[in-house]
Every structure is written in C-alpha cells, then in structure tokens.
C-alpha cells in the first residue's frame, strides 16, 4: 500500500510511462498522513 503524501504511483506515473514502466493504480489510505509533514 502507498502511505506517502503524494503516492509514488501518482507522482511517477508520467516518468514511468515514458520509460516503459508499469504503474499500478493505488491510493493513499485516508487514516495515514504524510511522512513529509
């Protein structure tokens, strides 16, 4: 699961698609906050 503030799957989607990577659709759990806070 993705517990980060702006979920890696969202943020790196463009980069991965341009480099041929595959992105799994995921989400940030609503009860877990951001490690960047």
């Amino acid at each position: 699961s993705c517990n980060t503030a702006t979920c890696v799957t969202h943020r790196l989607a463009g980069l991965l698609s341009r480099s041929g990577g595959v992105v799994k659709d995921n989400f940030v759990p609503t009860n877990v906050g951001s490690e960047a806070f």
Partner: antibody
C-alpha cells in the same frame, strides 16, 4: 524561489469570522498537501487542518478543536490555500502558518510561510 | 489522539557539546516522526523526517533515530546557531500532533 505568503489575519471579536489566505509560488502547488499550523503566543505548535493534493481528491482533515468551525480549501488555478474561520474563540488567538509538503518516495519537500497573526478579543 | 512527550523541557549546554533530545509517543507511530527547529520570530524549519532522514541542506551534525514509540534527535557538536526550540511531530494518525518542545539554551 519558493514562497508561501499568508494574509488575512487581524483582530476579531469572539464569535466573529476571518478568512486566511496563503499564496504559493515557485513550486507545483497542485501536487502538494497543505496544512495550517498555529502557535499561540509563547506556546508550542498545533496542527489545525490539512487538505490533500488534487490527485488525492483534495481530501480534508481537521483538529477536533476546530471541526465544524473552520474550513480549509484550495484553488489550484490561483495557487492559493484558504482557511475560513467562523465562531472564533479567544483560544484561537495564534500565529497561523501554512505548510506545503510533498512526498515523492525517494525524498520530500517541506515549505513554511512566515505566518499571520489572528487575535480574538473583545 | 497520539500524545508526544519531549524531554527534557530545557537543555543547557555549551557549543561543541553533544545534545540528545527525546520524544516519546503514547502509541506506535512507526517512523512517521519529524523534528523541527524554531527560533524566535521565525517559522519552524524541518530538520529530520521519517524519524531518521535529514532534510535538504541540513548539516550532518543533526541526526534522528528511533521507531515505534521512542525517538531521538542528536546534535553531535553544537554550533552557536543551534540554540533554539526543537519540536517533534507525528503524522501517522490524525490529528497530527507535536510535542511540547525542548528549549536548547547556552550554558
């Protein structure tokens, strides 16, 4: 250059309302989660509210002390964050900071504004 | 709500000495702990995130450790500019919370 500039603070009577703004520049505002954090005079830090990024549905969370009275919102087109504060109490007196943060897995970004003072007094 | 308890409340040390600040959480917060430095009249400044990761531009003399409920901020050799108030925070659960702060003062 990254900047977060809060405005809208001032003196308000108990029971009154204020709307704080936070203008962002120098980074991709829509990607960031943003919180308001406050600090009463001579006291510690207290988290107030958070709004998540556009891709995280702009979900909101609030501290119990402000739930039902404060509303956090954002306008990504204007790179702006807002805090609508209603039914203000003396204990809401504080410097209010906006804080933007971004976690991209390998590292993070964390930016604070300079704060705006809200004084609730009759 | 997760309560963070910092100790000591005040720490009096001299430049060049080692500072050890503690933060204890009332419930497990894995590694979702940050440390902030605040000087009078200024906004807080992030030092450490994820319990042990130094933020961009933070000198190597600052280090963080811990997981679960017990966390430590260590400043290996104090510089004059390090005397300030330090706060820990947790973002593992809502509401996000801060410790009450440790004031690091010059002895």
């Amino acid at each position: 250059e990254v900047q977060l500039v809060e405005s809208g603070g001032g003196l308000v009577q108990p029971g009154g309302s204020l709307r704080l703004s936070c203008a962002a520049s120098g980074f991709t505002f829509s990607n960031y989660w943003i919180s308001w954090v406050r600090q009463a005079p001579g006291k510690g830090l207290e988290w107030v509210a958070e709004i998540r990024s556009e891709s995280d549905a702009s979900a909101t969370h609030y501290a119990e002390a402000v739930k039902g009275r404060f509303t956090i919102s954002r306008d990504n087109a204007k790179n702006s964050l807002y805090l609508q504060m209603n039914s203000l109490r003396a204990e809401d007196t504080a410097v209010y900071y906006c804080l933007a943060y971004f976690d991209y897995g390998l590292a993070i970004q964390n930016y604070w504004g300079q704060g705006t003072l809200v004084t609730v007094s009759s | 709500e997760i309560v963070l308890t910092q100790s000591p409340a005040t720490l009096s040390l001299s430049p060049g000495e080692r500072a050890t600040l503690s933060c204890k959480a009332s419930k497990r917060v894995t590694t979702y702990v940050s440390w902030y430095q605040q000087k009078p009249g200024q906004a807080p400044r992030l030092l450490i995130y994820g319990a042990s990761n130094r933020y961009l531009g933070i000198p190597a003399r600052f280090s963080g450790s811990g997981s679960g409920t017990d966390f430590t901020l260590t400043i290996s050799s104090l510089e004059p500019e390090d005397f300030a108030v330090y706060y820990c925070s947790q973002s593992y659960n809502y509401p996000y919370t801060f410790g009450q702060g440790t004031k690091l003062e010059i002895k």
